[in-house]
């Protein structure tokens, strides 16, 4: 069941230079049909079968994880980096993403989120919490997961196009999805809309322009008239169960 999925290492990665040109910049085709070129994948892990998951940045890890070298607290130190369990209250940290949901990094210590701690423009950093298109959710609020008091109580919900950290930051009918260098609120997909079918578990995503998941009662499936097409060009749309 969905509830047994305890850790989601969401492999939404950046386009590597060979595909995307210098520095991972997409071609102009992304502007025309965002997301169509890039298929992503998710890695689901249960606590009784936990495998270290390689990563380049926090965004590729689950909501209760951050990206770092196993022997060091901060990412980017060199060597292989993997998704590590987030740090609980009063543990040392270097950035918000290292702290578990509901906490943020203040003066090197994970502290409980309290809106009064944040000056204007300050942010509680996290990662995308989209488990993918095969799990359907109530529009706008994703899947069973921890949410923070900060997200739920202290600030207004973001409209489409606003910066977000998680889907609970966004208004009803929207989810928080990757948008090039940032994450913004985007519409949950409706019936008939093109969706991204995440392939096998553990495959690395290449979405720099991420779509939301399909809305309630919908699943991301191959469009019927595209069955004959080659695997690489199959079009997926949100369809009724």
């Amino acid at each position: 069941t969905l509830n047994s999925v305890l850790i989601n290492s969401n492999a939404i990665k950046n386009l590597p230079p060979p595909l995307g040109g210098a520095g991972g910049q997409p071609g102009s085709a992304v502007s025309v049909a965002p997301g169509v070129l890039y298929e992503g994948g998710n890695k689901y892990q249960t606590l009784d079968n936990y495998q270290p998951y390689p990563c380049a940045e926090d965004e590729e890890c689950g909501s209760d994880e951050y990206c770092s070298s196993p022997s060091r607290g901060a990412a980017g130190v060199g060597g292989v980096q993997i998704c590590l369990a987030c740090r609980k209250r009063r543990k040392r940290c270097m950035r918000h993403a290292m702290c578990c949901p509901g906490n943020y990094c203040k003066n090197g210590i994970c502290m409980p989120s309290d809106h009064s701690h944040f000056p204007r423009g300050e942010i509680e950093e996290s990662i995308i919490e989209n488990l993918g298109n095969d799990h359907n959710a109530a529009a706008g609020d994703g899947y069973p997961r921890r949410t923070t008091l900060t997200s739920k109580i202290y600030h207004t919900k973001g409209q489409e196009g606003s910066v977000c950290l998680r889907s609970s930051d966004c208004a009803a009918g929207l989810c928080c999805a990757r948008h090039f260098w940032s994450k913004i609120c985007k519409p949950v997909l409706k019936e008939g809309q093109v969706c991204t079918k995440h392939k096998r578990k553990g495959s690395h995503g290449l979405e720099i322009f991420q779509r939301c998941y399909c809305g309630e009662g919908l699943a991301c499936r191959i469009q019927k008239d595209h069955h004959q097409a080659s695997n690489s060009s199959r079009l997926h749309t949100c369809q009724r169960h």
Epitope: N14, V32, P119, R120, I123, E125, V163
Partner: antibody, heavy 124, light 107 residues
Framework: QVQLVESGGGLVQPGGSLRLSCAAS????????LHWVRQAPGKGLEWVSS????????YYADSVKGRFTISRDNSKNTLYLQMNSLRAEDTAVYYC?????????????????WGQGTLVTVSS | DIQMTQSPSSLSASVGDRVTITCRAS??????LNWYQQKPGKAPKLLIG???SLQSGVPSRFSGSGSGTDFTLTISSLQPEDFATYYC?????????FGQGTKVEIK
């Protein structure tokens, strides 16, 4: 108080190099996407480059690709723009910009906060 | 690239006037558009995000509307401090692109 202060501008000859810095304060630097935007004298704004919050993804305008490199040092709260093979058309004020936050009221947007800029003049 | 065409390029108006600036995208950009104000020698200031969201500290005489390809920035009653250049920015596609600017001058 969010503050972005650019430095490193100056006069350089065509073909030369320059490294711009943007020192940030008043916020947790490592949590934000950052950008360089330039403005030639008397002209409009032109996006130059962006970098994701942890620095893994970088993006460049076609006009600077292969010549400019954006980077960040989260331990120093500083954003950089290494500019090589400079041309006369690179002459501009270079601004550092930062995205907003979901905790802004209302929730923030991209390119929300800007520094005051540093002038780069490429001339022989 | 997505082209942003701003009009007019300049306008003369008096204090108290209602001023409208438009921005047209070469393709649909949903509501992924910001409006900025820039005064001479100063950095741009974000006025409106996502086409219509007034930013904190920005006077309510500024408003934004539109979606898709056509967008409008309206100043309901022009004040002396509003004389400046205004830019739109689309962030729907890469690269992000600005309009060429609209200079609002005193009549």
């Amino acid at each position: 108080q969010v503050q972005l202060v650019e430095s490193g501008g100056g006069l350089v000859q065509p073909g030369g190099s320059l490294r711009l810095s943007c020192a940030a304060s008043g916020f947790t630097f490592s949590n934000y996407g950052l950008h360089w935007v330039r403005q030639a004298p008397g002209k409009g704004l032109e996006w130059v480059s962006s970098i994701s919050y942890y620095g893994s993804s970088t993006y460049y305008a076609d006009s600077v690709k292969g010549r400019f490199t954006i980077s960040r040092d989260n331990s120093k709260n500083t954003l950089y723009l290494q500019m090589n093979s400079l041309r006369a058309e690179d002459t501009a004020v270079y601004y550092c910009a930062r995205d907003g936050s979901h905790m802004d009221k209302p929730p923030g947007y991209v390119f929300a906060f800007w520094g005051q800029g540093t002038l780069v003049t490429v001339s022989s | 690239d997505i082209q942003m065409t701003q009009s007019p390029s300049s306008l003369s108006a008096s204090v108290g006037d209602r001023v409208t600036i438009t921005c047209r995208a070469s393709q649909g950009i949903k509501n992924y558009l910001n409006w900025y104000q820039q005064k001479p020698g100063k950095a741009p200031k974000l006025l409106i995000g996502a086409a219509s969201s007034l930013q904190s500290g920005v006077p309510s005489r500024f408003s934004g509307s539109g979606s898709g390809t056509d967008f409008t920035l309206t100043i309901s009653s022009l004040q002396p401090e509003d004389f400046a250049t205004y830019y739109c920015l689309q962030y729907y596609g890469m690269p992000p692109t600005f309009g060429q600017g609209t200079k609002v001058e005193i009549k």
